[in-house]
Interface confidence: low
C-alpha cells in the first residue's frame, strides 16, 4: 500500500505521521486559542502538537517558505491542572519541550495557553488564551481535510452614529488620538460620558479584546484616579471593588502617577502621570444620550486666596525662598506644597509664566516648579499631572546631566531668578539642590482678592518705579510728550521682570503699546530715550526688522519695530533711579603677534580675516581659538569703523559677523550682547534657512545667508588692561593670560 501523504500545501516530514499548515492572518482575522482550536478541529485535525525535533523543523520550513518570520502562532499547548501541567489539545502528553528562557512563567496568573515564536529558536511561551494570534493546524497523513469553516460574521458589537460601541447597558468610545487625562476626560464629558470605570473581569475582557482587535494604541486611560495618599477612586463615583493591576503596579513612581492606563497587550493596569498623553476609553450609559441637550458650562464663581498668596486665573500661587531658610530640594518642596493643599506649580501658558516672573522680582534664587523628567529621561511632565502644553526653556536647556554621577541627573526644573536676563526662563537642575519653590493651589470661592493698589494719578508701583498704561492712541513722539507732561517718561523695560509686569498691564486692552526704545533719534542705534543702557532685549522673531524705527510691546509680550508715526497705546514710567552713564572708553592694548594683526577701536580689538574663508561655525571656532568671538556690532560708530576697514577688501570676500538666528527665530549675538543696533541691507533679513549674517564689504550693510557659505570673518575681543603699578593684574573675561607689561605697546587707541 502506498504511504499515506499530506494534502497539498500541508507540510510533512517522512519520520512523522502528522501534516501541518500555518494560518498567518491579518490583524482582524487572528483568533484566540479556543477559536483556533475549534477551527483546526472543524478541518478534522487539531492545533499543532510538536513531539520531536523533526516536527519542529517541518514547521520551521513552512515559516521560511511563507516568510512568516517573528510571527506568533498558537500551538495545542494548554494548561490542565497543577498536577498535569501543560498538555497537547489532541490529548498527547508533552514529551518534547522547547520553552523560551524563563518560560512558562504564568505571568500575572493568566497564562494557560502556549504560543510558538516564528524565529530560528522556535521557542514556546505561555500566554493568555484570549490573545489574538496566528495558528498552526495538524492533521493525520492520508486524511483529507474538511472544508475550512467560513468565518462566523465578526461578532462586532453595534456602533452608534457618533462612533460609540454598544455593550450591554453602556456605550464606549475608543480614541485613536492621544491626549492628557484632563483633555481626554473633557472629551468624554462633552459627549455625555466620563472615562471608563471597569467593574468586572468580563467588562475588562470586553474592552481589552476590543482594543486588541481594532488597531490598538499601546495603552488607554481609564477612569481610575489615585489620590496623593494612594487611595483609589473611580471618576464616576462608583466603588472600587475590582482592580486588575499589572505586575509591580501601581508603583507610584516619583509619587506623581495619579492616573491609570490599561495596557492593550494584556488588559492589565498601570499607574501613570496624568499629563502623559495616551489614548483613552470613554463610557456613557445607554440612557444618557440626548443630542438636544448641551452640557452646561460652569459659571465662573469669584474666588480668592489666603493671606500671602497671589491670585491669578482662578489659582493661588506663593513663592518661597526669599529667605534662605525657606529653600528646599525638589522632593521636600513638593511635600511642602502638598501640605498646603496644592502642589508645585504647573505653568500652563505665557500669561501664567509672566505673572510668576513679575512676582519673582528682587529674588536672588531660582525656584522649583513641578516639571521633571525623573521617571523617563527627556520626557518632562508636571508632577500634578497637568499636560505639558507650554514650555519656556532658557538658552541651552534642558541640558540633562550635571556630572558623570548617575545621582546627579538634572531631572527637576526651576524658573531662573536673580539679576539674569534669562529670569523667568526654565532650567533643568539636580533635584537635590536647595532652591526656592513655587506652590499652587485652587482658589477658594469663600475668599475675595484685594484690588491692586493704584496711586491716585493712575500710576502703579512696581519695584523702584511707577507705571501707567495710557489707553489712548498716539504717535511715538506725541506719546513721549504726553508722558513728560505727566511728570514721567515713556517707559524703558530694563529686565524680564519689568517686561512681564508691562505685558500683564496690557491684559485687558488688546492694543499694542509704545515703549522708550527708539533708533531714529540715535543714528539707527536702538537706545532707551531715558538714557538707560540697553542690556536686556525681548525682540520677537526676526526683529528688529527696521533700521530707523520705534519699538512697541506687542500683545504676545515681545518687542517689534514700527514707523514712529503709527498710533498705539503707550506706557509711561516714573523712577527716581538715575541711569548709569556709559563708562569712559577703556584704556588698554591689543594682543601682538606675528600672525594676527589686531586693530584697536574704543574698548575692543578687532581681527579681520579675508584670506582664509570659512563657514559661520568654523569662523566662530577660529575666533574662539584666538580668545575672542565673532564680532558684535553694537553702535553706528562701530559699524562705520568696520565698514571703513573692510571696504578695501570688497573684491575678496564679504565677512561673517556674530549675529545668528536661533531655533525660535530670535536674532542673537554670539557673545550674548543685546541686539540694540541693526544695519540690514534693503530686503533683509529674508529666507527661512538663512540663519547667519554677513557684512557686505562694499556697503557695510548686513544680509542673512546660509551658515554653510564660505566667507571671511571678523573677530572681536576686549582690550587687555595692563597691570597697575601695584602689580595687581586686571584681565578681561575673554583673555586671562598674563601679558608681559614690559613690552612696548604700539597699538593703543
Amino acid at each position: 500500500t502506498p504511504e499515506p501523504k499530506c494534502p497539498e500545501d500541508w507540510g510533512a516530514s517522512s519520520r512523522t505521521s502528522l501534516c501541518f499548515k500555518l494560518y498567518a492572518k491579518g490583524k482582524h482575522e487572528k483568533k484566540t486559542w479556543f477559536e483556533s482550536r475549534d477551527f483546526c478541529r472543524a478541518l478534522g485535525g487539531d492545533l499543532a502538537s510538536i513531539n520531536n525535533k523533526e516536527e519542529q523543523q517541518t514547521i520551521w520550513r513552512l515559516i521560511t517558505a511563507s516568510g512568516s518570520y517573528h510571527k506568533l502562532f498558537w500551538l495545542g499547548l494548554t494548561y490542565g491542572s497543577p498536577s498535569e501541567g501543560f498538555t497537547w489539545s489532541d490529548g498527547s502528553p508533552v514529551s518534547y519541550e522547547n520553552w523560551a528562557y524563563g518560560e512558562p512563567n504564568n505571568y500575572q496568573n493568566v497564562e494557560y495557553c502556549g504560543e510558538l515564536k516564528g524565529d530560528p529558536t522556535m521557542s514556546w511561551n505561555d500566554i493568555n488564551c484570549e490573545h489574538l494570534n496566528n495558528w498552526i493546524c495538524q492533521i493525520q497523513k492520508g486524511q483529507t481535510p474538511k472544508p475550512e469553516p467560513t468565518p462566523a460574521p465578526q461578532d462586532n458589537p453595534p456602533v452608534t452614529e457618533d462612533g460609540w460601541v454598544i455593550y450591554k447597558d453602556y456605550q464606549y468610545y475608543f480614541s485613536k488620538e492621544k491626549e492628557t487625562m484632563d483633555n481626554a476626560r473633557a472629551f468624554c464629558k462633552r459627549n455625555f460620558g466620563d472615562l471608563v470605570s471597569i467593574q468586572s473581569e468580563s467588562e475588562k475582557k470586553f474592552l481589552w479584546k476590543y482594543v486588541n482587535r481594532n488597531d490598538a494604541q499601546s495603552a488607554y486611560f481609564i477612569g481610575l484616579l489615585i489620590s496623593l495618599d494612594k487611595k483609589f477612586a473611580w471618576m464616576d463615583g462608583s466603588k472600587v471593588d475590582y482592580v486588575s493591576w499589572a505586575t509591580g503596579e501601581p508603583n507610584f513612581a516619583n509619587e506623581d502617577e495619579n492616573c491609570v492606563t490599561m495596557y492593550s497587550n494584556s488588559g492589565f493596569w498601570n499607574d501613570i502621570n496624568c499629563g502623559y498623553p495616551n489614548a483613552f476609553i470613554c463610557q456613557r450609559h445607554n440612557s444618557s444620550i440626548n443630542a438636544t441637550t448641551v452640557m452646561p458650562t460652569m459659571p465662573s464663581v469669584p474666588s480668592g486666596c489666603k493671606e500671602g498668596w497671589n491670585f491669578y486665573s482662578n489659582k493661588c500661587f506663593k513663592i518661597f525662598g526669599f529667605m534662605e531658610e525657606e529653600r528646599k530640594n525638589w522632593q521636600e518642596a513638593r511635600k511642602a506644597c502638598i501640605g498646603f493643599g496644592g502642589n508645585l506649580v504647573s505653568i500652563q501658558n505665557e500669561k501664567e509664566q509672566a505673572f510668576l516672573t513679575y512676582h519673582m522680582k528682587d529674588s536672588t534664587f531660582s525656584a522649583w516648579t513641578g516639571l521633571n523628567d525623573v521617571n523617563s529621561e527627556h520626557t518632562f511632565l508636571w508632577t500634578d499631572g497637568r499636560g505639558v502644553h507650554y514650555t519656556n526653556w532658557g538658552k541651552g536647556y534642558p541640558g540633562g546631566r550635571r556630572s558623570s554621577l548617575s545621582y546627579e541627573d538634572a531631572d527637576c526644573v526651576v524658573i531662573i531668578g536673580g539679576a539674569s536676563n534669562e529670569a523667568g526662563k526654565w532650567m533643568d537642575d539636580t533635584c537635590d539642590s536647595k532652591r526656592g519653590y513655587i506652590c499652587q493651589t485652587r482658589s477658594d470661592p469663600s475668599l475675595t482678592n484685594p484690588p491692586a493698589t493704584i496711586q491716585t494719578d493712575g500710576f502703579v508701583k512696581y519695584g523702584k518705579s511707577s507705571y501707567s498704561l495710557m489707553r489712548q492712541k498716539f504717535q511715538w513722539h506725541e506719546a513721549e510728550t504726553y508722558c513728560k507732561l505727566h511728570n514721567s517718561l515713556i517707559a524703558s523695560i530694563l529686565d524680564p521682570y519689568s517686561n512681564a509686569f508691562a505685558w500683564l498691564q496690557m491684559e485687558t486692552s488688546n492694543e499694542r503699546v509704545w515703549i522708550a526704545l527708539n533708533s531714529n533719534l540715535t543714528d539707527n542705534q536702538y537706545t532707551w530715550t531715558d538714557k538707560w543702557r540697553v542690556r536686556y532685549t525681548n525682540w520677537a522673531a526676526d526683529e528688529p526688522k527696521l533700521k530707523s524705527a520705534c519699538v512697541y510691546l506687542d500683545l504676545d509680550g515681545y518687542w517689534k519695530t514700527a514707523h514712529c508715526n503709527e498710533s498705539f497705546y503707550f506706557l509711561c514710567k516714573r523712577s527716581d533711579e538715575i541711569p548709569a552713564t556709559e563708562p569712559p572708553q577703556l584704556p588698554g592694548r591689543c594682543p601682538e603677534s606675528d600672525h594676527t594683526a589686531w586693530i584697536p577701536f574704543h574698548g575692543h580689538c578687532y581681527y579681520i580675516e579675508s584670506s582664509y574663508t570659512r563657514n559661520w561655525g568654523q569662523a566662530s571656532l577660529e575666533c574662539l581659538r584666538m580668545g575672542s568671538s565673532l564680532v558684535s556690532i553694537e553702535s553706528a560708530a562701530e559699524s562705520s569703523f568696520l565698514s571703513y576697514r573692510v571696504e578695501p577688501l570688497k573684491s575678496k570676500t564679504n565677512f561673517w559677523i556674530g549675529l545668528f538666528r536661533n531655533v525660535e527665530g530670535t536674532w542673537l549675538w554670539i557673545n550674548n550682547s543685546p541686539v540694540s543696533f541693526v544695519n540690514w541691507n534693503t530686503g533683509d533679513p529674508s529666507g527661512e534657512r538663512n540663519d547667519c549674517v554677513a557684512l557686505h564689504a562694499s556697503s557695510g550693510f548686513w544680509s542673512n545667508i546660509h551658515c554653510s557659505s564660505y566667507k571671511g570673518y571678523i573677530c572681536k575681543r576686549p582690550k587687555i588692561i595692563d597691570a597697575k603699578p601695584t602689580h595687581e593684574l586686571l584681565t578681561t573675561k575673554a583673555d586671562t593670560r598674563k601679558m608681559d607689561p614690559s613690552k612696548p605697546s604700539s597699538n593703543v587707541a
Partner: nanobody, 124 residues
C-alpha cells in the same frame, strides 16, 4: 535584560561580619547605578545602600551607616556589600538591584532589575 545573582548570605552571630556579592550578566553593567535592599518577614522592603555608575558616590540608610560598605568592580560586573557589626535587626532577605530611572537612590521604584535575594540571619 540584566540578570542579577546574589550570594554570600548565611547565619552569623551578632557583632560578626558578612560580605554579600551580586553578579550581573546581560546588558552593560556600567550603565547602571546599583543598590542593595532588604526585606524582613512581614515588613516592607527597605533601602540599604546604593552606589553610582562610576562608583565614586554612595548612599546608605541611616540604620547601616558606618557599619556597611557598598562597592563595585565594573571589570568583573560585581557589586559587594560588606556588613560589619551585624545586629539581629539586620536579619532579612537581601536583594541586589539595578537602577533604571533617575529616581532618588533610596527609591525602590527606580530599580528595574532585581535579584532573587540571599538570606542573612543574625542570631543574638
Amino acid at each position: 535584560q540584566v540578570q542579577l545573582q546574589e550570594s554570600g548570605g548565611g547565619l552569623v552571630q551578632a557583632g560578626g561580619s558578612l560580605r554579600l556579592s551580586c553578579a550581573a550578566s546581560g546588558r552593560i553593567f556600567s550603565a547602571y547605578a546599583m543598590g542593595w535592599f532588604r526585606q524582613a518577614p512581614g515588613k516592607e522592603r527597605e533601602f540599604v545602600a546604593a552606589i553610582s555608575r562610576s562608583g565614586d558616590s554612595t548612599d546608605y540608610a541611616d540604620s547601616v551607616k558606618g557599619r556597611f560598605t557598598i562597592s563595585r568592580d565594573s571589570a568583573k560586573n560585581m557589586v559587594y556589600l560588606q556588613m560589619n557589626s551585624l545586629k539581629p535587626e539586620d536579619t532579612a532577605l537581601y536583594h541586589c538591584a539595578a537602577r533604571t530611572v533617575s529616581a532618588p537612590p533610596s527609591a525602590a521604584w527606580g530599580y528595574g532589575y532585581w535579584g532573587q535575594g540571599t538570606q542573612v540571619t543574625v542570631s543574638s
